[in-house]
Amino acid sequence: QGWQAFKNDATEIIPELGEYPEPPPELENNKTMNRAENGGRPPHHPFETKDVSEYSCRELHFTRYVTDGPCRSAKPVTELVCSGQCGPARLLPNAIGRGKWWRPSGPDFRCIPDRYRAQRVQLLCPGGEAPRARKVRLVASCKCKRLTRFHNQSELKDFGTEAARPQKGRKPRPRARSAKANQAELENAY
């Protein structure tokens, strides 16, 4: 049986489990989803500001289905994607297409996940198989992080969300199995 067999309202997402601070350094590397990949102009402050709290970050809402093997959530889950741009809070409204960009100068900042929330998701499986569950970590908020010149692209890998996590039926979690990451066939639904 194909996915047509399932109705959109067949399963509900179990309420989120709560929020967690920045996860341990074991996020899967391949879970980048389609966020701005550290792209665009390097976000820099036109005036010298040393306090990262003065910077703000773009938080984009992103929805995707959670999958595990052939099983898929009946409804997509929503989380935040932290865009690659950071800027002075007074210049960077939290919305796309508004506000002014500034010229690069000064330290490099990146917009990265700050807090995660854990959510248990029920999955429907084809062929009349019993439903399964998976715990997924979803980005709940973003923050600006100042990078030194020693940070390189490989060190930015853990800025990706876990959302695209591989397929373990897990509770959201930072995980150290990068290989599993490319497994989760995520379907992005905007």
Partner: antibody, heavy 120, light 107 residues
Framework: EVQLQQSGAELVRPGALVKLSCKAS????????IHWVKQRPEQGLEWIGR????????IYDPKFQGKAIITADTSSNTAYLQLSSLTSEDTAVYYC?????????????WGQGTTVTVSS | DIQMNQSPSSLSASLGDTITITCHAS??????LSWYQQKPGNIPKLLIY???NLHTGVPSRFSGSGSGTGFTLTISSLQPEDIATYYC?????????FGGGTKLELK
């Protein structure tokens, strides 16, 4: 770094009870299911059961029902396995492991194991 | 309960050989099949999950295949560090069950 640190070896008398611990670091146990697996000397792996630390829900292999009780304390990020009415058949290494899907199709990190020896 | 029958129970091979271990489930387990490696005196480690996906850090000489009830773990170009006991495990339904293990030794 993800780690599951298990309590030390236990030497116990037949009929006694023992409680093993499995302390997680590098991740929150509420984000996973925690499983316990038994391995008798020179034998294979036997699944005992699992807990969802978020709500305390447990599932056991019927063979271990009445023998094992799995609990978790999310405040200390620790899972526990209690074994009662111990006999020589319970002499084994007991492992905890984490898994993020249910039923657990893969356990990606394991504790170092706790050896339980039942002897009079 | 789903029974997992693993064969052979022991296997002798030479370095550089390609070896195959099979696991047969008593009923359809879809893709919910993992393989673990346990070296002597060590803990089990996840090698492969969902039939064919390599866990982080596992060398590409390990591969898994199969579907439904029949599954295979293949190690190509056997290395000294591959000497271990290998277990399959089904995650289709509770209770979870493991195969009896295949002890791999050097000839």
């Amino acid at each position: 770094e993800v780690q599951l640190q298990q309590s030390g070896a236990e030497l116990v008398r037949p009929g006694a009870l023992v409680k093993l611990s499995c302390k997680a670091s590098g991740f929150n146990i509420k984000d996973y299911y925690i499983h316990w697996v038994k391995q008798r000397p020179e034998q294979g792996l036997e699944w005992i059961g699992r807990i969802d630390p978020e709500n305390g829900n447990t599932i056991y292999d019927p063979k271990f029902q009445g023998k094992a009780i799995i609990t978790a304390d999310t405040s200390s990020n620790t899972a526990y396995l209690q074994l009662s009415s111990l006999t020589s058949e319970d002499t084994a290494v007991y492992y905890c492991a984490r898994c993020d899907n249910d039923p657990g199709s893969e356990m990606d990190y394991w504790g170092q194991g706790t050896t339980v020896t039942v002897s009079s | 309960d789903i029974q997992m029958n693993q064969s052979p129970s022991s296997l002798s091979a030479s370095l550089g050989d390609t070896i195959t271990i099979t696991c047969h489930a008593s009923q359809n387990i879809n893709v919910w099949l993992s393989w673990y490696q346990q070296k002597p005196g060590n803990i089990p480690k996840l090698l492969i999950y969902k039939v064919s996906n390599l866990h982080t850090g596992v060398p590409s000489r390990f591969s898994g295949s199969g579907s439904g009830t029949g599954f295979t773990l293949t190690i190509s170009s056997l290395q000294p560090e591959d000497i271990a006991t290998y277990y399959c495990q089904q995650g289709q339904s509770y209770p979870l069950t493991f195969g009896g293990g295949t002890k791999l030794e050097l000839k």
